[in-house]
């Protein structure tokens, strides 16, 4: 069991306290009420590409 704040989720995912695991942020546009989506707003998705060097 992960202790929040210790092992971060991989890029493009966020921790769900309701499921006790990392969840894919890609599902958040379809269902923004999910608890882990708050964490997705703070980090860019895996497909995010910087437009500057």
């Amino acid at each position: 069991e992960r202790v929040p704040g210790t092992t971060p989720c991989s890029r493009g995912s966020s921790w769900s306290a309701d499921l006790d695991k990392c969840m894919d942020c890609a599902s958040c546009p379809a269902r923004p009420h999910s608890d882990f989506c708050l964490g997705c707003a703070a980090a860019p998705p895996a497909s995010f590409r910087l437009l500057w060097p």
């Epitope: 069991e1 769900s16 306290a17 309701d18 499921l19 006790d20 969840m23 599902s27 379809a30 269902r31 009420h33 999910s34 608890d35 882990f36």
Partner: antibody
């Protein structure tokens, strides 16, 4: 075979308390979210409460918030519902159900239910 | 909370009939819609999840469709064991899971 067996129901006076249990078998209990759903006599299904696999996150319907407490003991493969300040409108069959491994998407196994009757 | 409205509330049908039950959400729920079957004195049983995915072990005569606000459960050829009450359930607006009021399928 997945089995969920509720117990602890019965007749209780208004204002009283009951503790329901749901014993799980036939699967590894600890990775699954669980929930309680109730059904008043002759009525439809009403979601009551949800608990995360570790027990660290809980949610309640507005109708029971502040009166009911959901918990689990993963070492005993058991889910609980502590019901306090019971009202006549809490009279129902209470079911425990197992959640899927994605976010609140479905509940694939249900117990047979235990009847709670609140009456003086 | 999102309201789920099923229609009809009850219907009478014969063995072999094609039966369609409708569920409407008060706002868009994408495809986060499940269907359950309940027989008298028994627990609900999951039939369809994510609007159209058939739960393992459920006969293929059951199918689900729809997205957004309008969904249907279809039984292609009603069997004697299908006489029961059917409930839809939304899992979009978590944790406020809500069910439809149910549709009772009776023998004509």
């Amino acid at each position: 075979e997945v089995q969920l067996l509720e117990s602890g129901g019965g007749l209780v006076q208004p204002g009283g308390s009951l503790r329901l249990s749901c014993a799980a078998s036939g699967f590894t209990f600890s990775p699954y979210p669980m929930m309680w759903v109730r059904q008043a006599p002759g009525k439809g299904l009403e979601w009551v409460s949800y608990i995360s696999p570790s027990g660290g996150s809980t949610h309640y319907a507005d109708s029971v918030k502040g009166r009911f407490t959901i918990s689990r003991d993963n070492s005993k493969n058991t889910l609980y519902l502590q019901m306090n300040s019971l009202r006549a409108e809490d009279t129902a069959v209470y079911y425990c159900a197992r959640g899927g491994d994605t976010y609140f998407d479905y509940f694939d196994y249900w117990g047979q239910g235990t009847l709670v009757t609140v009456s003086s | 909370d999102i309201q789920m409205t099923q229609s009809p509330s009850s219907l009478s049908a014969s063995v072999g009939d094609r039966v369609t039950i409708t569920c409407r959400a008060s706002q868009s729920i994408s495809s986060y819609l499940n269907w359950y079957q309940q027989k008298p004195g028994k627990a609900p049983k999951l039939l369809i999840y994510a609007a159209s995915s058939l739960q393992s072990g459920v006969p293929s005569r059951f199918s689900g469709s729809g997205s957004g606000t309008d969904f249907t459960l279809t039984i292609s050829s009603l069997q004697p064991e299908d006489f029961a009450t059917y409930y839809c359930q939304q899992s979009y607006s978590t944790p406020g899971i809500t069910f439809g009021q149910g549709t009772k399928v009776e023998i004509k």
